[in-house]
Interface confidence: medium
């Protein structure tokens, strides 16, 4: 009678994470009597996966659970596969005895696990930056296998080219991680822009995963200021407006100064939004020119998003006409809130 052979017909098996792997093994004879054991890896450090004779292996089932004794199929199924299960599995025949002794091993089956990458997480800089500055975005995805993966960056649908990507670890591993850093130049129109990191992997069946970052959380568009003077019906009053345009985010505080002295401070509330996502706001000051003998320097000072203040000044000429002299007050008006200061 020919000597028993242990046959593992599959050199390799590829299984998706979460699924069940079937590892096939047959013997050519029932002699010698003795159990089959399955191991992952070879040598003294090999890991016991299944022992026919004894032990509890909750994830392992035999393919033929309760079959006829003439059958010599020792195939097993391992449920709920994870990347940690990857490796070479050996079906080993033992000869019955006290103790059982190893008789013959199969050639081994390499189990490769396909694991999906995690949803990409995109993060931007910790502090806001202004247009024309270059900012870095990072994208991370973990837990995928095999190692081959494609990562692309987009800004508003346009592919970016200035990025650097690493896949770790470099050597063999049960699963891998990808880390990419992209450089993006900000423009004033980027409040509504999105940066997208797209990851394509064999496990995703052509449907890549995407992570996004809104540039609204990264950009700061500083305001432009314009101070203008309009006459009003009352000949001794002048309306001075400060147009605060194209700023983002909304957090803004405005202070009026008359000849360097604080006249009023207010916080932007009723703003108007532009198509590009930036905001406009206007504040005005009703100046009673008859209260002033000399020219007045009016300054609109704006502190935007905690940044150093920017300001714009306007020189108000005072003409000494008798009919314009009288009242000793300057009236200030912002919208419907009018108050006189004495």
């Amino acid at each position: 009678e020919e000597e028993l052979q242990v046959i593992q017909p599959d050199k390799s098996v590829l299984v998706a994470a979460g699924e069940t792997a079937t590892l096939r093994c047959t013997a050519t004879s029932l002699i010698p009597v003795g159990p089959i054991q399955w191991f992952r890896g070879a040598g003294p450090a090999r890991e016991l996966i299944y022992n026919q004779k004894e032990g509890h292996f909750p994830r392992v089932t035999t393919v033929s659970e309760s079959t006829k004794r003439e059958n010599m199929d020792f195939s097993i199924s391992i449920s709920n596969i994870t990347p940690a299960d990857a490796g070479t599995y050996y079906c080993v025949k033992f000869r019955k005895g006290s103790p059982d002794t190893e008789f013959k091993s199969g050639a081994g089956t390499e189990l490769s696990v396909r694991a999906k990458p995690s949803a990409p997480v995109v993060s931007g800089p910790a502090a806001r930056a202004t247009p024309q500055h270059t900012v870095s975005f990072t994208c991370e995805s973990h837990g995928f296998s095999p190692r081959d993966i494609t990562l692309k960056w987009f800004k508003n649908g346009n592919e970016l080219s200035d990025f650097q990507t690493n896949v770790d670890p470099v050597g063999e591993s049960v699963s891998y991680s990808i880390h990419s850093t992209a450089k993006v130049v900000l423009t004033r129109e980027d409040v509504h822009s999105q940066v997208i990191c797209e990851v394509a992997h064999v496990t995703l069946q052509g449907d890549p995963l995407r992570g996004t970052a809104n540039l609204s959380e990264t950009i700061r568009v500083p305001p432009t200021l314009e101070v203008t003077q309009q006459p009003v019906r009352a000949e001794n009053q002048v309306n001075v407006t400060c147009q605060v345009r194209k700023f983002y985010p909304q957090r803004l505080q405005l202070t009026w100064l008359e000849n360097g002295n604080v006249s009023r401070t207010e916080t932007a509330s009723t703003v108007t939004e532009n198509k590009d996502g930036t905001y406009n706001w206007m504040s005005w000051l009703l100046v009673n020119v008859s209260a002033h003998r000399d020219d007045v320097k009016l300054t609109c000072q704006v502190e935007h998003d905690g940044q150093p203040a920017v300001s714009k000044s306007h020189d108000l000429k005072v003409s000494a006409h008798p009919k314009e002299q009288g009242s000793n007050t300057a009236a200030e008006n912002t919208g419907s809130n009018e108050r006189n200061i004495y």
Epitope: I36, Q52, K68, R69, E70
Partner: antibody
Framework: QVQLKESGPGLVQPSETLSLTCTVS????????LSWVRQPSGKGPEWMGR???????AYNSALKSRLSISRDTSKNQVFLKMNSLQTDDTGTYYC??????????????????WGPGTMVTVSS | QFTLTQPKSVSGALRSTITIPCERS????????VSWYQRHLGRPPINVIY?????PSEVSDRFSGSIDSSSNSASLTITNLQMDDEADYFC?????????FGGGTKLTVL
């Protein structure tokens, strides 16, 4: 839990046919094989035959000519028919659940659950 | 086809150790596995050892099985003998496609 119960006539006339039924619960006949084992009074047990999980049968060659085992999986029942009974067929008849030693294709079977047995007397 | 021979009876004192042999008539005892069963009067048999030396989880560790190639026999050993161990014990093995039982041993606890 796993249970097996034999039923049938306690007394059979010589030369007649014995019909026994084994009703099981707690497992599926599609997954486990069942054997019939008898123990004549004052002797050791004797394996009679097996109904495999897939419907095939195997018989003890000494009894094969007069033994037939069948099943009805929908009723969870396995049947034994043995003809031409003689007085030395008297004894306790058990149905047993078979277990492959390692829960897989391996040539060692043992009997992990037994029914209480039914006493069969062959007498005129 | 071989036979399995057991002594008709064995006795042992309470809390002692006894061994029940099961001799194979022909062929090597190592060519097939041996199982052991216990049967109390009026109760169905239960499996106490399978595969020569494997014990089902619900069976007391006082029960152990072994094989001895020099005597071509298998043995069931019961330590710390209890009154409830008094029962019939029989061994079982197989040859080709047939299961073979020993004649059974009556254990008496003194």
């Amino acid at each position: 839990q796993v249970q097996l119960k034999e039923s049938g006539p306690g007394l059979v006339q010589p030369s007649e046919t014995l019909s026994l039924t084994c009703t099981v619960s707690g497992f599926s006949l599609a997954s486990y094989s069942l054997s019939w084992v008898r123990q004549p009074s004052g002797k050791g047990p004797e394996w009679m035959g097996r109904m495999y999980y897939d419907g095939d049968t195997a018989y003890n060659s000494a009894l094969k000519s007069r033994l037939s085992i069948s099943r009805d999986t929908s009723k969870n029942q396995v049947f034994l028919k043995m003809n031409s009974l003689q007085t030395d067929d008297t004894g306790t008849y058990y149905c047993t659940r078979d277990r492959s030693m390692f829960g897989t294709d391996y040539p060692h079977w043992y009997f992990d659950f037994w029914g209480p047995g039914t006493m069969v007397t062959v007498s005129s | 086809q071989f036979t399995l021979t057991q002594p008709k009876s064995v006795s042992g004192a309470l809390r002692s150790t006894i061994t029940i042999p099961c001799e194979r008539s022909s062929g090597d005892i190592g060519d097939s596995y041996v199982s052991w069963y216990q049967r109390h009067l009026g109760r169905p048999p239960i499996n106490v050892i399978y595969a020569d030396d494997q014990r089902p989880s619900e069976v007391s560790d006082r029960f152990s099985g072994s094989i001895d190639s020099s005597s071509n026999s298998a043995s069931l050993t019961i330590t710390n003998l209890q009154m409830d161990d008094e029962a019939d014990y029989f061994c079982q093995s197989y040859d080709s496609k047939i299961d073979i039982f020993g004649g059974g041993t009556k254990l008496t606890v003194l």
